[in-house]
Amino acid sequence: RRDVAHGILNEAYRKVLDQLSAGKHLQSLVARGVGGSLGGGAGDDAEPLSKRHSDGIFTDSYSRYRKQMAVKKYLAAVLGKRYKQRVKNKGRR
């Protein structure tokens, strides 16, 4: 019975470690991108409270990832003329 309990605890512990590892991996990937160099605008203030008060690591990572994606779309549109990737493409031009 003790072995079973240990097995359950070990499994739960491993899952927690996996989640933390995944979070750190996401954070490292995002940190290589925008990494806070670019400031967010109105979009940051508009985030729901639940998101704003959730786990700091993941909120920060998500915010950075969002900025990274926004900048990528901007660069594609203004320097690459990739209109498909525009924020709102209404088919003009």
Partner: antibody
């Protein structure tokens, strides 16, 4: 695309520049601010996207605020220093530029 | 921060000749999203090239952009008097947005 609001200001006095567009749907385009100090090169300040979110160059964050309405895009220089003396350009997608507006910061 | 280094100014070119302007980036340009601009005194910049090598609408075919990664070049063939201007490259970076090169003045003789 036309910029306005440039003038002589003393250091620390907030200044708002306005970019007025006609025939352009701001909900479909990125609007960018670029500046150029007298006799110097171009310097990217930041942009505002279709949804109204603004993004800034690392050096510009906290020093500038970009916002927009239906036919205007504003650039606020929160606390100008002499280093902010420049011609400020507003551009749609970097392919349609205004003539620029000159800001002089001096005591 | 990303730095774009251009051919030092000024660059001289004879009418009908060819001139090449180099633009070297301190780090890889995202998606090769690099543009070239022409600016004349008292005027705003005019986009000549986007996506490193695509000619912007209405720009004469004597302008040609090439390169990828960290090294890009603007070549003007059959130079005309009207080409006298300062040329800027502008590269895209996910970590820094847009960075402009320092500019290269082309003098036509």
């Amino acid at each position: 695309v036309e910029e306005s609001g440039g003038r002589l200001v003393t250091p620390g006095t907030p200044l708002t520049l306005t970019c007025t567009v006609s025939g352009i749907d701001l909900s479909s385009y990125y609007m960018t601010w670029v500046r150029q100090a007298p006799g110097k090169g171009l310097e990217w300040v930041g942009f505002i996207d279709a949804g109204g979110s603004a993004y800034y160059a690392t050096w510009a964050k906290g020093r500038f605020t970009i916002s927009k309405a239906s036919t205007t895009v504003d650039l606020k220089i929160t606390s100008p220093t002499t280093e902010d003396t420049a011609t400020y350009f507003c551009a749609r997608d970097l392919d349609l530029w205004g003539p620029g507006t000159l800001v002089t910061v001096s005591s | 921060a990303a730095v774009l280094t251009q051919t030092p100014s000024p660059v001289s070119a004879a009418v009908g000749g060819t001139v090449s302007i180099s633009c070297k980036s301190s780090e890889s340009v995202y998606g090769d999203y690099l543009a070239w601009f022409q600016q004349k005194p008292g005027q705003p910049p005019k986009q000549l090239i986007y996506d490193a090598s695509t000619l912007a609408s209405g720009v004469p075919s004597r302008f040609k952009g090439s390169g990828s990664g960290t090294q890009f070049t603007l070549t003007i063939s059959g130079v005309q008097c009207d080409d006298a201007a300062t040329y800027y490259c502008a590269g895209g970076y996910v970590s820094a947005g847009v960075a402009f090169g320092g500019g290269t003045e082309v003098v036509v003789k």
